[in-house]
């Protein structure tokens, strides 16, 4: 059995690529508008031009379309530390990013916040900071990793996960305390 095509699939498949079906007359295929423009009026008939108008300032369309309105340009989220990499044009949305030596942490699919890359003080860089990932640090002896910072083993409490990493240091401290003075 051949599955029934939905209305949208039918409408899309009727016209060749780069054209769309006239909303009032399904025997007419109109040419889509170029990126940077939007649909002002459908083509009046076969082979006749679609009336496309350029997007106004503050709006854009990034691909060929038959939208009745251009899309509003995105604004970079200053409260998230974002900066504008490139401004909005009629055919491209604003591009937002982070400053140098920062990385993006995504709170959701389209929302990111900028954070400073870890410097790995008291450690070494295992993996360099990348666009969407913080530096990965390896700590020097006598230090353990906590929230991607190398912290002195003197701050390691028995209940914390650092006990394994700091075990030699903890035992040394105990040994020093236990041994009497000569």
């Amino acid at each position: 059995l051949v599955p029934h095509l939905g209305d949208r699939e039918k409408r899309d498949s009727v016209c060749p690529q780069g054209k769309y079906i006239h909303p009032q007359n399904n025997s007419i295929c109109c040419t889509k508008c170029h990126k940077g423009t939007y649909l002002y009026n459908d083509c009046p008939g076969p082979g006749q031009d679609t009336d496309c108008r350029e997007c106004e300032s503050g709006s854009f369309t990034a691909s060929e379309n038959h939208l009745r309105h251009c899309l509003s340009c995105s604004k970079c989220r200053k409260e998230m530390g974002q900066v504008e990499i490139s401004s909005c044009t009629v055919d491209r949305d604003t591009v937002c990013g982070c400053r140098k030596n920062q990385y993006r942490h995504y709170w959701s699919e389209n929302l990111f916040q900028c954070f400073n890359c870890s410097l790995c003080l008291n450690g070494t860089v295992h993996l360099s900071c990348q666009e969407k990932q913080n530096t990965v640090c390896t700590c020097h002896a006598g230090f353990f990793l906590r929230e991607n910072e190398c912290v002195s083993c003197s701050n390691c409490k028995k209940s914390l996960e650092c006990t394994k990493l700091c075990l030699p240091q903890i035992e040394n401290v105990k040994g020093t305390e236990d041994s009497g003075t000569t």
Partner: nanobody, 116 residues
Framework: EVQLLESGGGLVQPGGSLRLSCAAS????????MSWVRQAPGKGLEWVSA????????YYADSVKGRFTISRDNSKNTLYLQMNSLRAEDTAVYYC?????????WGQGTLVTVSS
């Protein structure tokens, strides 16, 4: 069923402190970002703060930066908001929310009133 239960609100003088708590149940708390959102009387919702699943990343609205601290205890399935140097403009109902904007689940809220 997801449940978020806020507590710790109340009346406090300007400059005072409060600590809000949110007890979560019905989902794997330790794997989700969590947020605090507030609604002042007659105003819209404001995303106040967020913390990621592991507690490594935090977000604060400019209006609360340096005064509020978000934290979580995954072993207790609890989210916290420590609020210091409170101002009259912090008066609002504070909601605990699962995830970050757009928020999918909210608590019932706890009222914080800052007044002399």
């Amino acid at each position: 069923e997801v449940q978020l239960l806020e507590s710790g609100g109340g009346l406090v003088q300007p400059g005072g402190s409060l600590r809000l708590s949110c007890a979560a149940s019905g989902f794997t708390f330790a794997t989700y970002n969590m947020s605090w959102v507030r609604q002042a009387p007659g105003k819209g919702l404001e995303w106040v703060s967020a913390i990621d699943a592991g507690g490594m990343h935090t977000y604060y609205a400019d209006s609360v930066k340096g005064r509020f601290t978000i934290s979580r205890d995954n072993s207790k399935n609890t989210l916290y908001l420590q609020m210091n140097s409170l101002r009259a403009e912090d008066t609002a109902v504070y909601y605990c929310a699962k995830g970050t904007e757009p928020f999918d689940y909210w608590g019932q809220g706890t009222l914080v009133t800052v007044s002399s």
